[in-house]
Interface confidence: medium
């Protein structure tokens, strides 16, 4: 049997912890240092944990050593400390902070935990938020004090200030659009809403401190986007309200966003705001929600997708049992990272239940969704018979899946950074989620997919998508299965003597490592945890070669489709070449621009779709009040402005070039003179002269690029 | 620099007419809507109606349908605007102003404004 | 018609304070995700002076103390700090249909 053969796969450490927590929070310090931090603690979810135990490892998982003694309150103290979480700093990997759940203590470290100091601070870490470029600087929350307050400590948590009360929630502003140690905070107001306030020295003096939104619901803060909700109340109504979206994209004043819709909002969700536009769920007062994207700037959103699966306590699903499991919303929306574009969603048609959901996935961000192709043939090789005109097709596990299924917890669909393309599922083929699970791949960006592996698995990948690794789920088993060809194949290593429980499959994040930490249990009766790394360099063989890249696009698997006029070419390394890309591979990608076609346009401002939706052509709106063509006012002669044909360049679209875009864009002329005498055009190869009749001057037109200049036109009218 | 320059004030008797004119500098009045609005004293505005001077069609308010009408001469750079049959609730300070493409309908630029005044 | 209700009619506030007004449309000025609705000041003797057009663009030269907000049919004014210059009347106007028509005016006193 292949256990053996000399195996490719080694397990290179293996240690028992003697640890009954019933969680295990992991942290690899990254930056190619071997620490590995764990702390386990009990379930969070009902109460505070009544003990915790850490552990460091400093050879990336081989041995784990117990640190808890060290996390005491001083002399004469025998008090054990209590760890509900401990924070990395994302400035300095040698730094983390363990804060106690009940004490105001917290404990640092400035040397990858190998001393740790103690120090009694003036409240209680509920959350802490540490700076990402300054390391001293972190921000600290009072979540149980009556008067929610915020705290500051610039000596990386040994003294602290207050610095707000009241506090709903808080940030750090986000480079580079804010300036350096901004803060945003949410503030409770007597009304019951709240402020949003930013503030660049820490509320120390008004000068800095600027009110961003006033009587806000929520709000929150996104890379280039901010976002919050309002209450409005409807005209003529006392009882029905509805809420608003306010955005700001690039840190202007917040806006409220417009909504094609007749129904009431109760409330947003946002989905997505990582490409330079918006994906909002809205959620209407019929319990069902919509999925809504924006142009750039996030304030005018139109309707992509109906009837997308979104929970929410207390709105959408709080009367199912989901509310017993879910205190945060969430939607089953899912970005194909790595790419632009390309997302999955779940439908959902009646109750939240698995037989009413369906998944649907978009390669234009959203312009039209499809369900997903189901894949030919089983892992053994028959055929499935499933057609799409049937209604059958392949659906595809996601956050409401995993609720659904407490005792054998579904996996997230996994897609990332370092496999553009490749993504693995939990999911079943028919006409909804209900059938049967297995595990999905697809390598070519949701376009085509095949079913991997049967029943429900753990799954994780190393070495940029180089090889896969999974273990099944709801068994014990001593069975690690992995491929290096993208899923096509898989073998076998048996990775203990004994079945151990597992209870996860993790690789260091960023997943260009080769090697796998396998988290279970080995005590028949008691659960104790139980960590074994698992290395896989050797199943890759060498080094990759320039000859075992290909280079692919997305745009290959939809007949070389542009999106948003770019189409974007990736290194590949070919799924049946056996060696491994390293841990510094650097994937190139070329994004090369395509020609524009008319789907690269919309109608530009006072302009709709003529009534003959085939020509696709945009015409004059009879509705729109304003003067079409007109130059702006003031428009000094000499200089020149954009007149609109009444297209635009859809936002974000890169495309150039071609008929399309001649035809279509707006054209630069020359700014009109403001009182006209009669006069002569006449044209001398390289430029176009204007004789004024009345006084006899001459002057040339600010016109560039001519060439042979042999006839010319003049519009009269503009 | 654009401006709309106005008529100087004017003194009628009921039943009269007046015409009113409105000179714009620095930009072609073609490339815009000239409208006209109506101040009584005291009071707000209200929007009498506007001329597209590219090709003279013009948009009224109902409620000066008839009372009011609004010409331009590009030559000039000029618009009009010609009130008939006055009476006292015609007094008023009467504005010129411009829109265009740019400004989605909101009005820019304006006139220093005529005063009307219809009196026995 | 569109008719545009004003509130309040008169407004009294501090100097450094926040003034805000309202402006409400018996049917909606939103044209495709645009809202033509726009904000001008007029003191007394001189012409109306735009200062926000389409809901909340400030036109530029307005000092950044004004701001315009709102969507649909509802809309508002602020003017934060208020200083003695603003002392004003304040009319909103739609271009979403003709003919286009003014609110009824607030007069932004100093308390």
């Known amino acids: 049997s292949a256990a053996l053969q000399p195996e490719p796969i080694k397990v290179y450490g293996q240690v028992s912890l003697n640890d009954s927590h019933n969680q295990m929070v992991v942290h690899w310090a990254g930056e190619k240092s071997n620490v590995i931090v764990a702390l386990a603690r009990d379930s969070l979810a009902l109460a505070r944990p009544k003990s915790s135990d850490v552990y460091v490892s400093y050879d990336y998982g081989k041995s784990f050593k117990k640190i808890s003694d060290k996390l005491n309150f001083g002399l004469g103290n025998r008090s054990e400390a209590v760890i509900a979480q401990f924070y990395h700093s994302p400035a300095d990997n040698k730094r983390y902070i363990f804060a106690d759940a009940y004490a105001q203590y917290l404990w640092i470290t400035f040397d990858f935990c190998n001393t740790l100091q103690g120090f009694s601070i003036p409240f209680r870490a509920a959350d802490l938020l540490l700076h990402s470029k300054a390391s001293n600087l972190l921000l600290g929350f009072d979540r149980s004090h009556p008067n929610k307050q915020l705290w500051k400590s610039d000596d990386f948590g040994q003294t602290w200030i207050m610095i707000q009360e009241h506090v709903k929630s808080f940030s750090w502003g986000i480079d580079p659009y804010d300036k350096p140690n901004t803060i945003y905070i949410e503030r409770h107001e007597p009304s019951g809403y709240s402020t949003v306030f930013r503030s660049t020295d820490f509320f120390q003096s008004r000068e800095n401190q600027e009110v961003i939104l006033e009587e806000v619901r929520d709000f929150q803060l996104r890379d280039k986007y901010m976002f919050a909700t309002k209450v409005v109340h409807l005209l003529g109504s006392e009882q029905q309200s509805s809420v608003q979206l306010w955005v700001s994209f690039g840190r202007k004043p917040m806006r409220a966003a417009q909504f094609v819709t007749r129904h009431p909002i109760n409330e947003y969700y946002i989905a997505d705001a990582s490409e330079d536009q918006v994906f909002v769920c809205v959620s209407h007062s019929n319990n069902r929600t919509n999925l809504y994207i924006s142009e750039a700037e996030g304030l005018k959103f139109s309707l992509s997708l109906e009837n997308v699966l979104y929970y929410s306590p207390g709105g959408a699903g709080s009367d199912t049992l989901v509310r017993y499991f879910a205190n945060e919303p969430f939607a089953d929306f899912h970005r194909v990272e790595g790419l632009q574009g390309v997302y999955i969603a779940t439908l959902i048609n009646g109750s939240m239940n698995e037989e009413n959901m369906r998944s649907v996935i978009t390669f234009d961000k959203g312009g039209t969704w499809e369900f997903l192709q189901a894949p030919a043939f089983t892992g053994y090789g028959e055929k499935i018979n499933c057609e799409l005109s049937q209604g059958c097709s392949l659906h595809l596990a996601q956050r409401l899946s995993q609720l659904l299924n407490l005792q054998l917890r579904r996996m997230p669909i996994l897609s990332k950074e370092s496999a553009p393309g490749l993504i693995i599922a939990t999911g079943s083929v028919g006409k909804n989620l209900a059938s049967k699970t297995n595990v999905y791949i697809s390598s070519s960006a949701g376009a085509r997919w095949r079913e991997a592996l049967p029943g429900p698995h753990y799954y994780t990948w190393g070495d940029h998508g180089g090889i896969i690794t999974a273990i099944a789920q709801g068994m014990e088993t001593n069975e690690l299965k992995y491929s290096t060809n993208e899923g096509e194949t898989w073998k076998t290593f048996i990775f203990s003597e004994k079945p151990v429980f597992v209870y996860g499959l993790l690789t260091e994040p960023g997943e260009k490592s080769t090697v796998f930490t396998i988290f279970g249990s080995n005590k028949e009766n008691v659960h104790s945890w139980l960590i074994l790394q698992v290395n896989a360099t050797d199943a890759l063989g060498v080094p990759c070669t320039e000859n075992d890249y290909k280079l692919w696009s997305p745009s290959d698997e939809r007949g070389n489709e542009c999106l948003l006029g770019h189409k974007t070419v990736f290194k590949r390394r070919t799924p049946h070449a056996t060696c491994f890309n390293g841990e510094d591979f650097d994937r190139p990608v070329v994004v090369s621009n395509c020609s524009c076609t008319r789907e690269d346009y919309e109608c530009d401002f006072g302009f709709k779709m003529s009534e003959d939706l085939s020509l696709e052509v945009c015409v004059p709106d009879p509705e729109f009040s304003g003067k079409s063509y007109s130059p702006p006012v003031p428009c000094p002669v000499g200089s020149t402005y954009r007149r609109t044909r009444g297209y635009r360049k859809i936002s974000g679209d890169t495309c150039s070039g071609g008929d399309v875009e001649a035809r279509l864009e707006g054209e630069l002329v020359p700014c009109p003179l403001a009182e006209e005498n009669e006069f002569i055009l006449y044209a001398v190869r390289k430029s176009i002269y204007r004789y004024d009749l009345a006084s006899g001057a001459t002057e040339q037109l600010p016109l560039t690029g001519l060439r042979a200049a042999v006839a010319l036109d003049f519009d009269y009218e503009h | 620099e654009v401006q709309l320059q106005q008529s100087g004030a004017e003194l009628v008797k009921p039943g009269a007419s007046v015409k009113l004119s409105c000179t714009a500098s620095?930009?072609?009045?073609?490339?815009?809507?000239i409208h006209w609005v109506k101040q009584r004293p005291e009071q707000g505005l209200d929007w009498i109606g506007r001329?597209?001077?590219?090709?003279?069609?013009?948009k009224y308010d109902p409620n000066f349908q008839g009372k009011a009408t609004i010409t331009a001469d590009t030559s000039s750079n000029t618009a009009y605007l010609q009130l008939s049959s006055l009476a006292s609730e015609d007094t008023a300070v009467y504005y010129c102003?411009?829109?265009?493409?740019?400004?989605?309908?909101?009005?820019?630029?304006w006139g220093q404004g005529t005063s009307v005044t219809v009196c026995s | 018609d569109i008719v545009l209700t004003q509130s309040p009619a008169s407004l009294a506030v501090s100097l450094g304070q926040r003034a805000t007004i309202s402006c409400r449309a018996s049917?909606?000025?939103?044209?495709?995700?645009?809202?033509?609705m726009h904000w001008y000041q007029q003191k007394p003797g001189q012409p109306p002076k735009l200062l926000i057009y389409?809901?909340?663009t400030v036109k530029s030269g307005v000092p950044a103390r004004f701001s315009g907000s709102g969507s649909g049919t509802d809309f508002s004014l602020n003017i934060h700090p208020v200083e003695e210059d603003d002392i004003a009347m304040y009319f909103c106007?739609?271009?979403?249909?003709?003919?286009?028509?003014f609110g009824g005016g607030t007069r932004l006193e100093i308390k």
């Open positions: 049917e909606s000025v939103e044209y495709y995700g645009t809202n033509l």
């Open positions: 620095g930009f072609n009045i073609q490339d815009t809507y």
């Open positions: 001329i597209d001077p590219a090709n003279g069609n013009t």
């Open positions: 102003a411009t829109s265009n493409y740019y400004s989605r309908g909101a009005m820019d630029y």
């Open positions: 389409v809901a909340s």
């Open positions: 106007q739609q271009s979403r249909k003709v003919p286009w028509t």
